[in-house]
Every structure is written in structure tokens, then in C-alpha cells.
Interface confidence: medium
């Protein structure tokens, strides 16, 4: 196993309706064509998978079909977008990146995006 | 607490469609995932389709892809499910389900014991 540098922002705020985006970005090495990302949610000294998805490089990102993130993949780039966040999902979210293959195999872990999440008020009558 | 009625079942030939529809009354949260479970008789209930109704991509399982549809309108509070080229296997009576999601991310959004809020169901019936 052989470290690979990986780069995210380091505060985002999610929006008002709950969806946080953010880029993670990884150091080649060499000519990987098929990558998996993982996205980690730290807090309370607990790591919690959030999501992950497997692509080859120049394809479209595929996470689950019921998984909360979507994404999108540029080169060395993966655009993530996490939906579906309340106050109490706070934390810490942290892109680990494989390239799977070929040979030999390296794994980059970054140091973690801190995702800021406000509720809104609900507002009777107009909106969920 | 969160009240869901869903409507727009009925019997319709294999080829046709349907539209389900799914409001939302006395709601806490200004958003929630919200999905469309289906069971049939002697059939364990499944996940059909799911959005966050603040945005982003919806779900689909893979006997919805291509032919279902899910929708949002958050003025009215109602969700939709658009479902076109039914088959005989669509047979199920058609639930809907929503959770305002904090914190419980990992079970996804179309596991059955995600949701805290359901209807009351809709009778769905293809004919060969």
C-alpha cells in the first residue's frame, strides 16, 4: 500500500435545503483506471461510511442507488455532493481515495472537510 | 405529528400508466426524504423511489428505472410518482414514506425501517 496525497476544502456550509458539496482532489501517482471514493463522517471520535462508489476513470461517479451523495468525476477531481442534511449531521466528512487499478495499489485519506449544518423553520403551508 | 395520504391508485392495463400522489400535513421539519414503498401480497415491502425534497438527485430501484418518476412539488407539499409501461408485476398496494433523515444516513434512503412516517397505501392493479 503506498500513500497518495488527497486535498478538500476545509469548512463548507451546507445550504439552506440540507445539501453540502465539496471537491476532493488526489495526487496521482500514475495511471489509474479505476478509482473508489469513500466519504467518512468523523464526530464524537466516531467514523461513520457515509457513502462510496467505485468509477473508472472517465466515467460517470455511481454511488448506490439509495446512497445520500451524488458526484462527479474530472480528472484527479471528484465533485461531492451530499443531500439530505439535518443540525445534528455536523461533523467532520473526510475523502479517502483508492485507485484500485492497476497495480500497485495506493490509498489517500484527506484531512477532512468540516461540514457546518443549520436547520431551517419549517414554514407551514408552503414548504416541507 | 407528520400525517401522509397518498392517492391516485387504481387498475389499469399492462402498458399504461398511473400517477401517485403523496401530501404531506402537519410537518415538522421544512424537509424530508421521502419515498415510495411497494408491497405485494405475501411480498416483503420494497423501496421504489426516493428524493430529498430540498433537491438533488432522486433514487430509484432498479424495477423503477426508466419507467417511474419521482417528483416533488413543495408548494403543495406533495410528492409524486410518475409510473408509465406498468406490468403485471407493479401489482402491490403503494406506501408512502417520510423522515426528516438526521443522523440516519447509513440504513439509505429506500430501507424500509429509515422512514418514521407513513401512509396509509394505495391499491395499484396491472392486468395482463
Known amino acids: 500500500c503506498k500513500a497518495m496525497h488527497v486535498a478538500q476544502p476545509a469548512v463548507v456550509l451546507a445550504s439552506s435545503r440540507g445539501i453540502a458539496s465539496f471537491v476532493c482532489e488526489y495526487a496521482s501517482p500514475g495511471k489509474a483506471t479505476e478509482v473508489r471514493v469513500t466519504v467518512l463522517r468523523q464526530a464524537d471520535s466516531q467514523v461513520t461510511e457515509v457513502c462510496a462508489a467505485t468509477y473508472m476513470m472517465g466515467n460517470e461517479l455511481t454511488f448506490l442507488d439509495d446512497s445520500i451523495c451524488t458526484g462527479t468525476s474530472s480528472g484527479n477531481q471528484v465533485n461531492l455532493t451530499i443531500q439530505g442534511l439535518r443540525a445534528m449531521d455536523t461533523g467532520l466528512y473526510i475523502c479517502k481515495v483508492e485507485l484500485m487499478y492497476p497495480p500497485p495499489y495506493y490509498l489517500g485519506i484527506g484531512n477532512g472537510t468540516q461540514i457546518y449544518v443549520i436547520d431551517p423553520e419549517p414554514c407551514p403551508d408552503s414548504d416541507f | 405529528q407528520v400525517q401522509l395520504q397518498e392517492s391516485g391508485g387504481g387498475s389499469v392495463q399492462a402498458g399504461g400508466s398511473l400517477r401517485l400522489s403523496c401530501t404531506v400535513s402537519?410537518?415538522?421539519?421544512?424537509?424530508?426524504?421521502m419515498a415510495w414503498f411497494r408491497q405485494a401480497p405475501g411480498k416483503e415491502r420494497e423501496g421504489v423511489a426516493s428524493?430529498?425534497?430540498?433537491?438533488?438527485?432522486?433514487g430509484y430501484a432498479d424495477s423503477a428505472k426508466g419507467r417511474f418518476t419521482i417528483s416533488t412539488d413543495n408548494a403543495k407539499n406533495t410528492i409524486y410518482l410518475q409510473m408509465n409501461s406498468l406490468k403485471p408485476e407493479d401489482t402491490a398496494m403503494y406506501y408512502c414514506?417520510?423522515?426528516?433523515?438526521?443522523?440516519?444516513?447509513?440504513?439509505?434512503?429506500?430501507?424500509?425501517?429509515?422512514?418514521?412516517?407513513w401512509g396509509q397505501g394505495t391499491q395499484v392493479t396491472v392486468s395482463s
Open positions: 414514506a417520510a423522515d426528516d433523515r438526521g443522523g440516519r444516513w447509513s440504513l439509505g434512503t429506500m430501507a424500509v425501517g429509515g422512514y418514521k412516517y
Open positions: 428524493i430529498w425534497t430540498g433537491g438533488g438527485t432522486p
Open positions: 402537519q410537518h415538522t421539519s421544512r424537509y424530508y426524504y
